[in-house]
């Protein structure tokens, strides 16, 4: 680093990356106070949270949310039927699989209604703000004497549908080796040290095929190989939190 | 949301330049670290060059003196200027973003360079090419 340094953990949770936000609402009346922004993921297609900050309005304000489908056989908007609270404030809305239709432009309409001219509307490609479960499972097996194979699953989503990144490292490594995996839930070390204890995790996010997802699951549970001797420092070698 | 959207590569001979341009939406560059990694032919993710909001730069050993990261706040740009480029540069290159976190000396000691894993949001990548 030039001045000073700027690393961190890699394995934080998924909202100390950045937090995906909508496109600007559009607001649709006359000068008012504008309302927050809504920010919508769909968690491996099992449901979607749409969230605002509740703490940006000037008083307690149980604000709705609407939503509908451009698209679709009902072009009404349709309310909201599980509400998210914070300190007995409404802040998001969880929207159940049932409802989610990933590739169809998802409208959304946050309001007042003590207001009602106070509402604005956004629209959100649901395809490019899924993401995945942490993949699991992950398995380890001999291919031959020196080489090892690494699979994972992930739950619910097409594995075409993913692209992974497998970071891997030996005892004696003081820094990961990084994969990106295209599609297949598998990778293969072609020479592996049987006297090393080898570490291996993956995170995976929806793209490119099926989504444009640009962010990324958190990492799976590590799964280890080899030699079980005591590492001789290991604080160095620990996993980053 | 948060929108990462590379462009600016190409197929270039060995010793030519590319500047690679990444247009940022849907956050502010206050609190972020902005990075280019790279994926090589043979699949392996390396961070390249990282820039934090106050300017702070990072590069790897390997574009050191060759490419510079830079970015332009007003239009929500991030670059990076490669010269000199040679074919081992030759990958798919993504612009990649986190928030800024305050880190201590001791983890970066823990360390020897940074991760793509660090970084959790991610473009779609730019394929560059450089031929001998």
């Known amino acids: 680093w030039s001045s000073k340094v700027l690393m961190s953990s890699a394995n934080e949770d998924i909202k100390a990356d950045l937090i995906l936000t909508s496109t600007a609402p559009e607001h649709l009346s006359a000068p008012t106070l504008p309302l927050p922004e809504v920010q919508c993921f769909v968690f491996n297609i099992e449901y979607m949270n749409c969230t605002w900050n509740s703490s940006s309005e000037p008083q307690a304000t149980n604000l709705t949310l609407h939503y509908r489908y451009k698209v679709s056989d009902n072009n009404t908007f349709q309310e909201c039927s599980h509400y998210l609270f914070s300190k007995e404030i409404t802040s998001g809305c969880q929207i159940q699989k049932e409802d989610i239709q990933l590739y169809q432009t998802f409208v959304v309409q946050l309001q007042d209604p003590q207001k009602p001219q106070r509402r604005a509307v956004q629209k959100l490609n649901l395809q490019n703000l899924v993401i995945p479960r942490a993949p699991e499972n992950l398995t380890l097996s001999n291919l031959s004497e020196s080489q090892l194979e690494l699979r994972w699953k992930s739950r619910h989503i097409k594995e075409r549908c993913l692209q992974y990144l497998v970071q891997y490292r030996s005892n004696r490594d003081r820094s990961w080796t990084e994969l990106i995996v295209n599609h297949e839930p598998r990778f293969s070390l072609p020479s592996v040290d049987e006297l090393k204890r080898y570490t291996f995790r993956v995170r995976s996010r929806y793209n490119p095929i099926c989504g444009s997802s640009q962010q990324w699951s958190k990492w799976s549970q590590p799964v280890h190989w080899g030699s079980h001797t005591v590492e001789e420092n290991p604080s160095l070698f620990a996993l980053e939190a | 949301q948060v929108q990462l959207q590379e462009s600016g590569g190409g197929s270039v001979q060995a010793g030519a330049s590319l500047r690679l341009s990444c247009s940022v939406s849907?956050?502010?560059?206050?609190?972020?670290?902005m990075s280019w990694l790279r994926q090589g032919p043979g699949n392996e993710c390396d961070a390249v060059a990282i820039?934090?909001?106050?300017?702070?730069?990072y590069y790897d050993d390997s574009v050191k003196g060759r490419f510079t990261i830079s970015e332009d706040n007003a239009k929500n740009m991030v670059y990076l200027q490669m010269n000199s480029l040679k074919p081992e540069d030759t990958a798919v290159y993504y612009c990649?973003?986190?928030?800024?976190?305050?880190?201590?000396?001791?983890?970066?000691?823990?360390?020897?360079?940074?991760?793509?894993?660090?970084?959790?949001?991610w473009g779609q990548g730019t394929q560059v090419t450089v031929s001998s």
């Open positions: 990649a973003a986190r928030r800024r976190r305050p880190v201590y000396d001791s983890d970066y000691e823990l360390r020897p360079r940074p991760l793509c894993g660090d970084f959790g949001v």
């Open positions: 849907g956050f502010t560059f206050d609190e972020s670290v």
């Open positions: 820039i934090s909001s106050d300017d702070n730069t």
